[in-house]
Amino acid sequence: GSTVPPMVNVTRSEASEGNITVTCRASGFYPWNITLSWRQDGVSLSHDTQQWGDVLPDGNGTYQTWVATRICQGEEQRFTCYMEHSGNHSTHPVPSGNSHHHHHHHH
């Protein structure tokens, strides 16, 4: 099939006092090969400081996956989710408040 770019969605949730968990989800992409990781100041976090989801079919002939990490509240600007798929790349910021969700479709 042809290449389908992912929809990337970054969310945040309270983890513990002063910390938040940030989760980056990529969905609706094809083929299944994807790079999805958290960067701190543009530098990838060590693998053992991120939690990873498997790349799974989402039922539409496309795939989905996620990656999460914990950060200090107030330091959201330092962190971005980096995505690379089929030769295209993008970076996605952490939304500034709990109620905000960022959805980006990349071509």
């Epitope: 100041d41 976090l45 993008s90």
Partner: antibody, heavy 118, light 112 residues
Framework: EIQLQQSGPELVKPGASVKVSCTAS????????IYWVKQSHGKSLEWIGY????????ISNQKFTGRATLTVDKSSSTAYLHLNSLTSEDSAVYYC???????????WGAGTTVTVSS | DILMTQTPLSLPVSLGDQASISCRSS???????????LEWYLQKPGQSPKLLIY???NRFSGVPDRFSGSGSGTDFTLKISRVEAEDLGVYYC?????????FGSGTKVEIK
């Protein structure tokens, strides 16, 4: 080959401003942040700040806030450090640098010497 | 700001000696998620610094295995197992776990 080419030396008067450029080649410019580091003569290194060329977002050392402005021109793969209200304390070598997968300053420019003198 | 204190400031060595440089941070540089952004750089006269070690103990591409990094929390060490002439210069530790990122004051490795 990944390279960061910096602009030439500058001699400027106190109170004036200067714009140092850093042109990247050998990689996709928007994939990696550009960092700026100051080194005064015979002294240690000082981190000024960084810019994400993809989003234009910046994070700076508070010490340089309001004095240093970081910008990029994606069309020419060039990052700029603009310093204003210069004093003799700003006389230094200014480096741009690029991170890699898991490290901060894997590639450095050759440095730009800025001399502030009347 | 996190202060990075390097010792010694000057390290006279004979070629073939082992050299050890200490770097102590004024507070822990282990980030909330466990990441520790501690790096070591070598700067030779008239040159840009060059990366040796990243994330405490990982050697950068092309760096000889006589260089090793270790430590955790606030105490970090760079060791050179057998100093060669090309290793002479000023060594800097650097932390990027917390803003503003800070460098140590440098350790000059020179011939005795």
């Amino acid at each position: 080959e990944i390279q960061l080419q910096q602009s030439g030396p500058e001699l400027v008067k106190p109170g004036a401003s200067v714009k140092v450029s850093c042109t990247a080649s050998g990689y996709a410019f928007t994939k990696y942040n550009i960092y700026w580091v100051k080194q005064s003569h015979g002294k240690s290194l000082e981190w000024i700040g960084y810019i994400d060329p993809y989003t234009g977002g910046t994070i700076s050392n508070q010490k340089f806030t309001g004095r240093a402005t970081l910008t990029v021109d994606k069309s020419s793969s060039t990052a700029y450090l603009h310093l204003n209200s210069l004093t003799s304390e700003d006389s230094a070598v200014y480096y741009c640098a690029r991170p890699g997968s898991y490290w901060y300053f894997g590639v450095w420019g050759a440095g730009t010497t800025v001399t502030v003198s009347s | 700001d996190i202060l990075m204190t390097q010792t010694p400031l000057s390290l006279p060595v004979s070629l073939g000696d082992q050299a050890s440089i200490s770097c102590r941070s004024s507070q822990s540089i282990v980030y909330t998620n466990g990441n520790t952004n501690l790096e070591w750089y070598l700067q030779k006269p008239g040159q840009s610094p060059k990366l040796l070690i990243y994330k405490v103990s990982n050697r950068f591409s092309g760096v000889p295995d006589r260089f090793s990094g270790s430590g955790s929390g606030t105490d970090f060490t760079l060791k050179i197992s057998r100093v060669e002439a090309e290793d002479l210069g000023v060594y800097y530790c650097f932390q990027a776990s917390y803003v503003p990122f800070t460098f140590g004051s440098g350790t000059k490795v020179e011939i005795k």
